[in-house]
């Protein structure tokens, strides 16, 4: 049966994005619509076609185009893509002969992380802290020289849509630790980082 | 030059089925709609169904109620339209067509099927 | 399904008279219509495709207009050869329909 193949995409906030659909088909189609998926009905955004061209619906004037104008293969892109944008999209291709043929692309919004990482001598402990803060929300590892050291960790989701994950190493002798490095790691899209930090009594 | 030609006319009795071939030349057989549309003895055109000949996707008009079925070989060029269950309304002239998109350009010489005990 | 009605079923003419025929859809099939010409014992030949866009080879005094629902075929200056019947058909939404003809004969 025909198809339309698309591709989900993820992005960095406040960058371009591009979504791509194609029809599998020996016809291009009379018209293309895409839509973004909502709860309750689909939002119209843009439509291409012969007769009318390029038609942006007045929500969406200033935020996309499609910027590959094709009745086969159809790109919207979005300009500076915020958190409003994160969700799927549909194109649908009105074909002669077979109707909407549709498919769905998805678009994810990332934001890279953003690290903190200091010490703190009290009395007879050190806890030294690894903040990250990103979408999604990132994970917070320890490599320390020796086992045995207690952490805790505490999550704190943000209204703009990341999450910091803050863990605090508790090492109870502390002179053992001077001059030795401790690393902090952020596991965020698959991608290990590694924050080092040596500790120098004060 | 482009051309459809379809098989001869064909006499058949209530109850039979009927397979008409439209035989395609002077062109990419998979880069264009097949359709076919029937016209009885003093009615109006009507539409009875088409083929994509890349995919093989088919879509038909539902008043032939599941009788109508159109394939094609796209080795032979050829496109096949068969009507079963066949009744003296079905008697009437049928033509093969090619369209891109809603582009028609080329048609096929008609094929008369008769109905008749 | 969505009814096609062509009107006048049928209408005599002269040569060079100028000649309109209009389609009425049963409900709105955008700019999807196309005309056909079709002579006795002969296929139907396209003229227009999309409402108003000529088939290449088809004399400029034929045109087509309108979207929505309303729709009009006409020849400026009618020639000998334009005498037959034409059919109007809608391609919005499947199965596609057929008017039920215009019959154009010489007064």
């Known amino acids: 049966q025909v198809q339309v193949v698309t591709q989900d995409e993820r992005e960095q906030l406040y960058t371009p994005a591009s979504l791509k659909c194609s029809l599998q088909n020996a016809q291009e189609a009379l018209i293309v619509t895409w839509q973004k998926k909502k709860a309750v009905s689909p939002e119209n955004m843009v439509t291409f076609s012969e007769n009318h061209g390029v038609v942006i619906q007045p929500a969406y004037k200033d935020k996309i185009n499609i910027t590959q104008l094709g009745l086969q293969n159809s790109t919207i892109t979005f300009w500076n893509i915020t958190l409003e944008d994160e969700g799927c999209y549909m194109c649908l291709f009105n074909t002669f002969g077979f109707g909407k043929i549709s498919g769905t692309a998805c678009l994810t919004v990332y934001v890279q992380p953003i690290v903190s990482l200091h010490y703190k001598f009290s009395e007879d402990h050190l806890n030294i802290t690894c903040s990250a803060t990103a979408r999604p929300a990132p994970m917070v590892f320890w490599k320390v020289p020796r086992s045995g050291i207690e952490n805790s960790t505490v999550t704190l989701s943000h209204p703009n849509g990341t999450t910091s994950v803050t863990s605090i190493l508790h090492i109870k002798d502390p002179k053992n630790q001077v001059g030795k490095e401790v690393i902090c790691q952020v596991l965020h899209l698959g991608t290990v980082t590694d924050f080092k930090q040596t500790v120098n009594k004060g | 030059q482009v051309q459809l030609v379809q098989s001869g006319a064909e006499v058949k009795k209530p109850g039979a089925s009927v397979k008409v071939s439209c035989k395609a030349s002077?062109?990419?057989?998979?880069?264009?709609?097949i359709l076919w549309v029937r016209q009885a003895p003093g009615q109006r055109l009507e539409w009875m169904g088409h083929i994509d000949p890349y995919y093989g996707s088919s879509n038909y008009n539902l008043k032939f109620k599941g009788r109508v079925t159109i394939t094609r070989d796209t080795s032979a060029s050829t496109a096949y339209m068969e009507l079963s269950s066949l009744r003296s309304e079905d008697t009437a002239v049928y033509y093969c067509?090619?369209?891109?998109?809603?582009?028609?350009?080329?048609w096929g010489q008609g094929t008369l099927v008769t109905v008749s005990s | 399904d969505i009814q096609m009605t062509q009107s006048p079923s049928s209408l005599s003419a002269s040569v060079g008279d100028r000649v309109t025929i209009t389609c009425k859809a049963s409900q709105d099939i955008n700019s999807y219509l196309s005309w056909f010409q079709q002579k006795p014992g002969k296929a139907p030949k396209s003229l227009i495709y999309?409402?108003?866009r000529l088939v290449d080879g088809v004399p400029s005094r034929f045109s087509g207009s309108g979207s929505g629902t309303d729709f009009t075929l006409t020849i400026s200056s009618l020639q000998p050869e334009d005498f037959a019947i034409y059919y109007c058909?809608?391609?919005?939404?499947?199965?596609?329909?057929f008017g039920q003809g215009t019959k154009l004969e010489i007064k």
């Open positions: 999309r409402a108003n």
């Open positions: 002077g062109y990419s057989f998979t880069d264009y709609i």
């Open positions: 058909l809608q391609y919005d939404e499947f199965p596609y329909t």
């Open positions: 067509g090619r369209s891109k998109r809603d582009y028609f350009d080329y």
